[in-house]
């Protein structure tokens, strides 16, 4: 069963989110389940490291963008949120928390600031930001 859920604080328009765990999940209570991923948008502003710790404490990680098709709800996300993308100064690469290197196919990086962390914005954009700047954040948990 699908329900058109309008989450005004999170998304720019109506987003289809499944409500039954038989189609998606299981996810932690009150998290959004979408195409075999669990997401939670946290309103409190934390720096990147605190955001990462918060996600880890809930057995999750910061958002990883791995597929536009599977994560098409991210196209509509409002505002800017920490995701799990960091610059590794030792090798110069931009990597996800799991060590995989960001593919330019998945995110267009916009270099507004100097920094080693990145904020997710709508339409698969990533904005470079200083890791110590407080921002809201998105946690993600894979269900499969």
């Amino acid at each position: 069963i699908w329900s058109a859920v309008f989450l005004n604080s999170l998304f720019n328009q109506e987003v289809q989110i499944p409500l039954t765990e038989s189609y998606c999940g299981p996810c932690p209570k009150n998290w959004i389940c979408y195409k075999n991923n669990c997401y939670q948008f946290f309103d409190e502003s934390k720096n990147w490291y605190e955001s990462q710790a918060s996600c880890m404490s809930q057995n999750a990680s910061l958002l990883k963008v791995y597929s536009k098709e599977d994560q098409d709800l991210l196209k509509l996300v409002k505002s800017y949120h920490w995701m799990g993308l960091v610059h590794i100064p030792t090798n110069g690469s931009w990597q996800w928390e799991d060590g995989s290197i960001l593919s330019p196919n998945l995110l267009t990086i916009i270099e507004m600031q100097k920094g080693d962390c990145a904020l997710y914005a709508s339409s698969f954009k990533g904005y470079i930001e200083n890791c110590s700047t407080p921002n809201t954040y998105i946690c993600m948990q894979r269900t499969v």
């Epitope: 597929s67 536009k68 098709e69 196209k75 610059h87 090798n91 110069g92 690469s93 931009w94 290197i101 593919s103 330019p104 196919n105 267009t108 990086i109 916009i110 270099e111 339409s123």
Partner: antibody, heavy 117, light 107 residues
Framework: QVQLVQSGAEVKKPGASVKVSCKAS????????MNWVRQAPGQGLEWMGR????????HYNQKFQGRVTMTVDKSTSTAYMELSSLRSEDTAVYYC??????????WGQGTLVTVSS | DIQLTQSPSSLSASVGDRVTITCRAS??????LAWYQQKPGKSPKVLVY???TLADGVPSRFSGSGSGTDYTLTISSLQPEDFATYYC?????????FGGGTKVEIK
């Protein structure tokens, strides 16, 4: 196997427009940016721009801004590049190129566009 | 927009020589650099991506290195089939560009 098949050679008059097509097969068309690159006779490669077939987002080389339009037809997995207000300096081979994870991993065979009065 | 300056624009070398081509970016491109080989009348072919990873099927005599703004393609022992033009290209941010190319000719 991945294939990018481009339309045939074109001869155009100065001031006219040209539209080159690139039919993709062998991969999920909407998952990878499609790029257009040109090469004038005896010259180097010049990136013209790219389009995301997923949502038709485009980024163009500033040099071509206002003259180039990139589009896709998802139903036929075909990308198009239209260049307007042609001049003799636009005589070149035009390539489409699929963005792999970290490089242009597949290229079309090229389309020669000749601009001559 | 980040520009790439490739050098030299051409070089003459003999079979067995070690050849080095450099590519300098006008800003940090964070290893988002690929190297291509192009032969006359043919489409380019990727050799190296992420600055140092060899593409599938590319002989091990090719190698890439560098970080930040300075990158290098090295051919450890030039073979007859390596005489071609080589291009670097970056994928950082929204606008992607090629270097001017390096033509490797037979001495």
């Amino acid at each position: 196997q991945v294939q990018l098949v481009q339309s045939g050679a074109e001869v155009k008059k100065p001031g006219a427009s040209v539209k080159v097509s690139c039919k993709a097969s062998g991969y999920t068309f909407t998952s990878y940016w499609m790029n257009w690159v040109r090469q004038a006779p005896g010259q180097g490669l010049e990136w013209m721009g790219r389009i995301d077939p997923y949502d038709s987002e485009t980024h163009y080389n500033q040099k071509f801004q206002g003259r180039v339009t990139m589009t896709v037809d998802k139903s036929t997995s075909t990308a198009y590049m239209e260049l307007s207000s042609l001049r003799s300096e636009d005589t070149a081979v035009y390539y489409c190129a699929k963005m792999g994870d970290y490089s242009f991993d597949y290229w079309g065979q090229g389309t020669l566009v000749t601009v001559s009065s | 927009d980040i520009q790439l300056t490739q050098s030299p624009s051409s070089l003459s070398a003999s079979v067995g020589d070690r050849v080095t081509i450099t590519c300098r970016a006008s800003g940090n491109i964070h290893n988002y650099l690929a190297w291509y080989q192009q032969k006359p009348g043919k489409s380019p072919k990727v050799l190296v991506y992420n600055a140092k990873t060899l593409a599938d099927g590319v002989p091990s005599r090719f190698s890439g290195s560098g970080s930040g703004t300075d990158y290098t393609l090295t051919i450890s022992s030039l073979q007859p089939e390596d005489f071609a033009t080589y291009y670097c290209q970056h994928f950082w941010s929204t606008t992607w560009t090629f270097g001017g190319g390096t033509k490797v000719e037979i001495k």
